[in-house]
Structure formats: structure tokens, C-alpha cells
Amino acid sequence: REPTVQCGSETGPSPEWMLQHDLIPGDLRDLRVEPVTTSVATGDYSILMNVSWVLRADASIRLLKATKICVTGKSNFQSYSCVRCNYTEAFQTQTRPSGGKWTFSYIGFPVELNTVYFIGAHNIPNANMNEDGPSMSVNFTSPGCLDHIMKYKKKCVKAGSLWDPNITACKKNEETVEVNFTTTPLGNRYMALIQHSTIIGFSQVFEPHQKKQTRASVVIPVTGDSEGATVQLTPYFPTCGSDCIRHKGTVVLCPQTGVPFPLDNNKSKPGGWLP
């Protein structure tokens, strides 16, 4: 029978670490991490790490009992967890019978938004105490709410990941810019900034009709030439406060009728914090 892995949590040092080993298996040949989505009961989904590793093809894998994987996450707070994946059978061949290296994977480490993860793996039995054993590590940075997978997470939706304000902005005259955007039921307060290397105008927008989408319009006084300036719209939603996903547009000249042109170069960018 071909070996498979059975993985479970192992927070402390592996018991083999306390024993003296004359010989140890070689290091891993490769270690990779990618995010995968799984559905959860609430109708939302969670993002997990798919950690896969490849064994070196030589006789030293005959000694291999397990591979231990540890993940450290660094964001607002630090997390640390390990799993030990035991091999169900001894290795009878250095490569898979069908060809190629022995490759295994573990899906289970949860992924938070916008977090840097350090993933380390080593084979067991590992080096003796006070010796450096062969190990492998990779970094993985999880994406934020603008990511095509993450943006549908409830946390991101509440931070406005699916909201398209469809900003239009035009220069009415030398002193004013008119900004129009579609509001969202997620919140009722917005800040519109006009930047042309420096901030040349801003305005708070309060939209009391929070329950439905409406088209809001605000005329903003400016202190410099506004044509080609950037409009940044910052929403204030309960879940993300002043660090919600920001949206951008560009100021053009208003047509003679005074109706602003629709913009097709809307851009979104996260604030300092991503949920």
C-alpha cells in the first residue's frame, strides 16, 4: 500500500527530539502554500492554507516517520500553531510507483485577511538536541478584501468590497468640483477628498437615507487647478470605521450642461487596515 498522511495538532516539541538519532531522513525537496476556500455553515466561507511538500528521492526516506509543519502568523496579533503529519506506511520506493516524487499535502491552517505567514516544515525524526536539522520554510502573505476570492467573505462585504460607488467628478469652475457617487446601505457617512499632489479640497458627506442606494451629489470648493485631480471617496462603515476600502476617480471638465461625465477608470484601494 502507498503511504498517506494522518495529521493532527502537536503544539510542543516532538517526542523524537528527546532521543538520540544516529541517522535522520533528509530534508524536504519542496514546500508550497496556497489558499483554498471551504464553505462553512453560516453561508460564509473560510480560507485555509493548502500546504504541500515533496520528499527527496533517496533511501533516507526509509527512516521517515512524520513531517511537522508550523505556521506563525503576523498581523495585529501573532499566532503560532503546528501539525504533525504521520506517514501511514514505511516507504518501499524512493519515488511514486507511477513516477514522480512523493508529494503530500495538509489543508487546515486558517487564513486571516492581510496577514504574513511563516510556514516551516521538517522531517521526523529530526536532528538531535543542539544540532541543526534539515528544515524548509516559506513565506505566504494572505490577500486583503480586494482579492477576487476574499472580496466575497462576509467580513469584506461589510467593509464594502462589493460596493461600486461609480464616482463621477467634474470641474464646474476654477473654485468648485462636483462629485457624484452611488451610496450604499452599509453606512451613511463619507469623506470626499480632491488631490492634485496635495489636498486641494474635501467635504464630509452625510446621507441619511441609509437603507437604500441613492445617487449622492456634493459640490466641493477647491484651492487649486482641479482638472485631472484625483477624487478619493472614503466611506465610514461600522465594521471598519475610518479604514474601509477607498475608491478613486478623476476630475474632468464638466460639459456645458453641467452634467458630469461618467468615469470608466474607477479604482478602489484599501485604507490602512484591511478587515
Partner: antibody
Framework: QVQLQQPGAELVRPGASVKLSCKTS????????MNWVKQGPEQGLEWIGR????????QYNQKFKDKAILTVDKSSSAAYMQLISLTSEDSAVYYC???????????WGQGTLVTVSA | DIQMTQSPASLSVSVGETVTITCRAS??????LAWYQQKKGKSPQLLVY???NLADGVPSRFSGSGSGTQYSLKINSLQSEDFGSYYC?????????FGGGTNLEIK
């Protein structure tokens, strides 16, 4: 049955290169590493290196790292070893040898005698 | 690299005798050892792998033993077709190395 076929001999000039072939049959080519072994005149056996036909991973004996280039052609189930910048020291019989479950050499080619001479 | 020291380098024996060839590794190779026989002008042939396992078609008069760093190949009741050169080889981790060989000749 498993067969590894190698040409009998190659005569090459000093400084030139030669590409030795090892045509295989009778087994799944991508399932086993292919090794190359040198045997000098009246001498013992030296492992040159090995290649995994599945993904072309190569491991060399450091001594031959700048002398041998190992390749495979999966479509024709053949392994190749190019020897470069040949000198009289490279005159020897070169064998291809297929690994077993681990790297014992279960099957050997007949060997190619390479003679480096002006 | 692991060195394989084989002894004796040559051996002159008669048909029907028993011989033992030894091989010492410079470090523990965890029983990852093979033995080969080579006749003059021919390619080597696998005799034994994993110290004790006989390759297909190898007569039972051949046997291997050993562990750690010390290994041996025993040939009981030598036959005329057994004469030639014998090599040990470790396959613990690359680079793989062979012993210097033992030349077995008829007395």
C-alpha cells in the same frame, strides 16, 4: 523484459564533446531514476549522476559536475549524457543503469566505450 | 562523501570453496547496500540489494549480511561461472560510491 541499449563505441578528438544515448524499453520510463556510471581501463566503477525522467531533476557527483550533462527524452524513453571538453582521462566505458525501488542499479546497459584520441 | 573500502582486492580460489568478501563504509549507511558481479568485457549485474535480498535469477549460494558500516558477501561452493569482479555500492544518499572491487580468479 527491461532493456537498456547503448552504442558500442565512440571515437572523439580531445577538446570535443560527445553525446551518449541509452534507449530503454520494457518498463515505464518515468517511474525510475536513470544513473550513469564510468569505468576507466582496468579500473573500478564511479557514479557520475542520476536523472529523474519524470521531471528531469538531476543530481551529480561533484567530480563530474562540469564534465557531464544529463538529459532525457520522455517521448522516446531515452536518456542521454553529453561529455564535454574531453581529454584522455575521459577515455572509459560509460554505462547507463536504471534504479530499482531505491538506488541499487537493477538493470545496466551494455556500456559505450569512449576513446579520446587525436 | 561516503567511502566504501572493499577487501580483499583479489582472491585466488578453487571451484567448490567458500569465499567471503567484505565492504566497510566510512559512515553508517543503514543497510542501503548492493553487490554486483562483473565478468570481463561485460556490464555489471546486480546480485544483492538491501544487504540480503537476492536479485532475480541469482543462485542461493550467494548471500549477504551486515549492518551499520560493515557488510559482507558470501559465496558458498564456488562454481566456474562465479569468477570475475565483485563490487559493493551504497545507495544511502547521493553521491553513491562503489568499493574498489574484488577480483575473484581460479586457482
Amino acid at each position: 523484459q527491461v532493456q537498456l541499449q547503448q552504442p558500442g563505441a565512440e571515437l572523439v578528438r580531445p577538446g570535443a564533446s560527445v553525446k551518449l544515448s541509452c534507449k530503454t524499453s520494457g518498463y515505464t520510463f518515468i517511474s525510475y531514476w536513470m544513473n550513469w556510471v564510468k569505468q576507466g581501463p582496468e579500473q573500478g566503477l564511479e557514479w557520475i549522476g542520476r536523472i529523474d525522467p519524470y521531471d528531469s531533476e538531476i543530481q551529480y557527483n561533484q567530480k563530474f559536475k562540469d564534465k557531464a550533462i544529463l538529459t532525457v527524452d520522455k517521448s522516446s524513453s531515452a536518456a542521454y549524457m553529453q561529455l564535454i571538453s574531453l581529454t584522455s582521462e575521459d577515455s572509459a566505458v560509460y554505462y547507463c543503469a536504471r534504479s530499482g525501488g531505491f538506488d541499487w542499479f537493477a538493470y545496466w546497459g551494455q556500456g559505450t566505450l569512449v576513446t579520446v584520441s587525436a | 562523501d561516503i567511502q566504501m573500502t572493499q577487501s580483499p582486492a583479489s582472491l585466488s580460489v578453487s571451484v567448490g570453496e567458500t569465499v567471503t568478501i567484505t565492504c566497510r563504509a566510512s559512515e553508517n549507511i543503514n543497510s542501503n547496500l548492493a553487490w554486483y558481479q562483473q565478468k570481463k568485457g561485460k556490464s555489471p549485474q546486480l546480485l544483492v540489494y538491501d544487504v540480503t535480498n537476492l536479485a532475480d535469477g541469482v543462485p542461493s549460494r550467494f548471500s549477504g549480511s551486515g549492518s551499520g558500516t560493515q557488510y559482507s558477501l558470501k559465496i558458498n561452493s564456488l562454481q566456474s561461472e562465479d569468477f570475475g569482479s565483485y563490487y559493493c555500492q551504497h545507495f544511502w544518499r547521493p553521491p553513491y560510491t562503489f568499493g574498489g572491487g574484488t577480483n575473484l580468479e581460479i586457482k
